[in-house]
């Protein structure tokens, strides 16, 4: 805590500028008006203040806004954001996506901090749901964000937001998460035509049930082996040889290379040898 001392003559700050870097902590406390600081927050980041000086500036803002900073100040916090505690951030009401982006930018290239996690939580709760634009922003900064959400949290994601999901955003999801995301994707993309639909739904198919795989087999989708290998084993097992052949199209030959791996291995064991022989791949049940 900085002692309350009178500002030396001629040192009263008229604006936030470079001259302040030469002020001692007590001089900043005494000579910088908190209201001036709040209106010129955007200048703070252009000035190479020390961590100790930033502590003083934060203290001044805390005194001015004991109930939490207004968004006009939050949006221009810049590196001062790194000085905030989760408790500080819980007092904020952040509604603008631009504010969120500005603060995420400060932490860019680093793993998630408690401050950023609290900020995201406050923002999403304030919006009421994880909408498309928010998800788009969060996955741009944190590609693993979607797969860090629990199945319970994912269940509250509206299907319309699924349009923001890129295939790589699902790379780290587990089967339980895909079980929740797949029906949402199916709903989101339902009005697309066959080939376009398959391109969009492909990344989510690890959560697809048997009946949907059967339906896809009727649409000449030519699923690649990499996608097939990510399907739920319990969803693949009931498929007939003819259905798998239609599902994979020209990629069916790839089954031979994967015959010892799930779900192919388990599926082969469920088929009649006569049916497997029709593929001409030498698969042994």
């Amino acid at each position: 805590e900085v002692e309350k001392t009178a500002c030396p003559s001629g040192k009263k700050a008229r604006e936030i500028d470079e001259s302040l870097i030469f002020y001692k902590k007590w001089e900043l406390e005494a000579c910088v008006d908190a209201a001036l600081l709040a209106t010129q927050m955007d200048r703070v980041n252009a000035i190479p203040f020390t961590y100790e000086q930033l502590d003083v500036l934060k203290h001044k803002l805390d005194e001015l806004y004991p109930q939490g900073y207004p968004e006009s100040v939050i949006q221009h916090l810049g590196y001062l954001f790194l000085k905030m505690s989760p408790e500080d951030i819980r007092k904020w009401n952040v509604t603008s996506l631009e504010t969120l982006k500005a603060l995420l930018e400060v932490n860019k290239g680093h793993e998630m901090s408690p401050q950023v996690a609290t900020l995201i939580d406050r923002f999403v709760k304030g919006r009421g749901q994880l909408d498309k634009d928010t998800l788009d922003t969060l996955t741009a900064f944190y590609p693993g964000y979607l797969c860090s959400l629990s199945p319970e949290e994912l269940s509250s994601v509206p299907p319309s937001s699924i349009w923001a999901v890129r295939p790589q955003d699902l790379d780290t999801c587990d089967p339980r998460q895909l079980d929740v995301l797949y029906p949402k994707a199916r709903l989101a993309f339902q009005n697309m035509n066959g080939s376009e639909y398959f391109v969009k739904i492909q990344s989510f198919l690890g959560g697809a049930p048997t009946e949907d795989l059967k339906a896809l087999s009727q649409q000449n989708v030519s699923m690649d082996l990499a996608t097939f290998m990510k399907l739920r084993t319990d969803a693949v097992l009931p498929l007939t040889v003819a259905e798998v052949q239609k599902l994979l199209g020209p990629h069916v030959e790839g089954l031979k290379a994967e015959e010892r791996h799930r779900p192919v291995r388990d599926w082969i064991l469920r088929q009649r040898q006569d049916d497997l022989d029709t593929l001409g791949l030498g698969l042994q049940g």
Epitope: M112, A117, P143, G144, S148, E153
Partner: nanobody, 116 residues
Framework: QVHLMESGGGSVQAGGSLRLSCVAS????????MRWYRQAPGKEREFVSA???????SYADSVKGRFTISQDNARKTVYLQMASLKPEDTAMYYC??????????WGQGTQVTVSS
Amino acid sequence: QVHLMESGGGSVQAGGSLRLSCVASGDTGYQPTMRWYRQAPGKEREFVSAIYSDQTTSYADSVKGRFTISQDNARKTVYLQMASLKPEDTAMYYCKLTTRRGSEYWGQGTQVTVSS
């Protein structure tokens, strides 16, 4: 860089219990997602359980009701309490950590053998 170290594996009779631990070191970021996978001889690695950033959990159907995942954030440790073990639970058990930036890290694994 993140390093994961599993421990707690061993041999046990069917019906017995074991508690696996996985300790993370390095910059894991805040509230990473922790998962357990297992790989039986000659089979693929399969999902067992997860604990997500909001501390809720999920399980593969084959272990639901028998296994419990938990976490000690202060110690950067995730646990897998395994009860009512069956011979088909025999496998190498691996811990996996995923950060919110999408970086994935695997441990070296710990062997669990259940005999009938």
